[in-house]
């Protein structure tokens, strides 16, 4: 999906009002310095591509993020404020089998959510030069 035509300000508002708090809740008890940010993004569409990938694509050691509250809110934000996004998701669903994954918070998941926090912060500051 090409995130170029999303309403970035509306997505930013959703992040600031609620998604950010859910990410903090998920990370509660973890030191902010515990993980190094290794994933970056260069502009808002790129950031949303990376955010979608880290949030919804299962990775080795962390397969359970999609059912977390911040993930649900991210998905709904993309569906409402990115034209055609929900249609791509609906179509993709037809080929998927139902997978009911238990929510398990592993260290790998905490690291992944830490990366997500960094991507969201970058998304909110699009004019900053890439380090």
């Amino acid at each position: 999906y090409d995130f170029t035509n999303c309403d970035f300000e509306k997505i930013k508002a959703a992040y600031l009002s609620t998604i950010s708090k859910d990410l903090i809740t998920y990370m509660s008890g973890t030191k902010s310095t515990e993980f190094n940010n290794t994933v970056s993004c260069s502009n808002r569409p790129h950031c949303l591509t990376e955010i979608q990938s880290l949030t919804f694509n299962p990775t080795a050691g962390c397969a359970s993020l999609a059912k977390e509250m911040f993930a649900m809110k991210t998905k709904a934000a993309l569906a409402i404020w990115c034209p055609g996004y929900s249609e791509t998701q609906i179509n993709a669903t037809q080929a998927m089998k139902k997978r009911r994954k238990r929510k398990v918070t592993t260290n790998k998941c905490l690291e992944q959510v830490s990366q997500l926090q960094g991507l969201w912060r970058r998304f909110n500051r699009p004019l900053l030069k890439q380090q």
Epitope: F56, P58, K67, M72, Q89, I90, K98
Partner: nanobody, 119 residues
Framework: EVQLVESGGGLVQPGGSLRLSCAAS????????MGWFRQAPGKERELVSA???????YYADSVKGRFTISADNSKNTAYLQMNSLKPEDTAVYYC?????????????WGQGPLMTVSS
Amino acid sequence: EVQLVESGGGLVQPGGSLRLSCAASGNIFANNIMGWFRQAPGKERELVSAIFSDGSTYYADSVKGRFTISADNSKNTAYLQMNSLKPEDTAVYYCARDDIVGAWSLDCWGQGPLMTVSS
């Protein structure tokens, strides 16, 4: 398998109000999110509003300030209160529960009541 049954569609005049209901055969928030989509003739299906188990809500710009989404956990029912209706709100409305990893599941959609705004 979750069943969703929508009701409340019909013909309404511009400026009028209507409330859609979506009854689920199980915990409405079993997977944290309920949404109302709509599809106007010849257009893509769009998500107009979503509500989460923590009570927070999202609205599309086109309906913000006119539509209100809510849920009654004790009745396993979600609602969409639609006020100040416009002809461009004419569409088939679907409620959907997110019941699959990473995508909206068509398996959990009801038939969708048609709501027509016309004088």
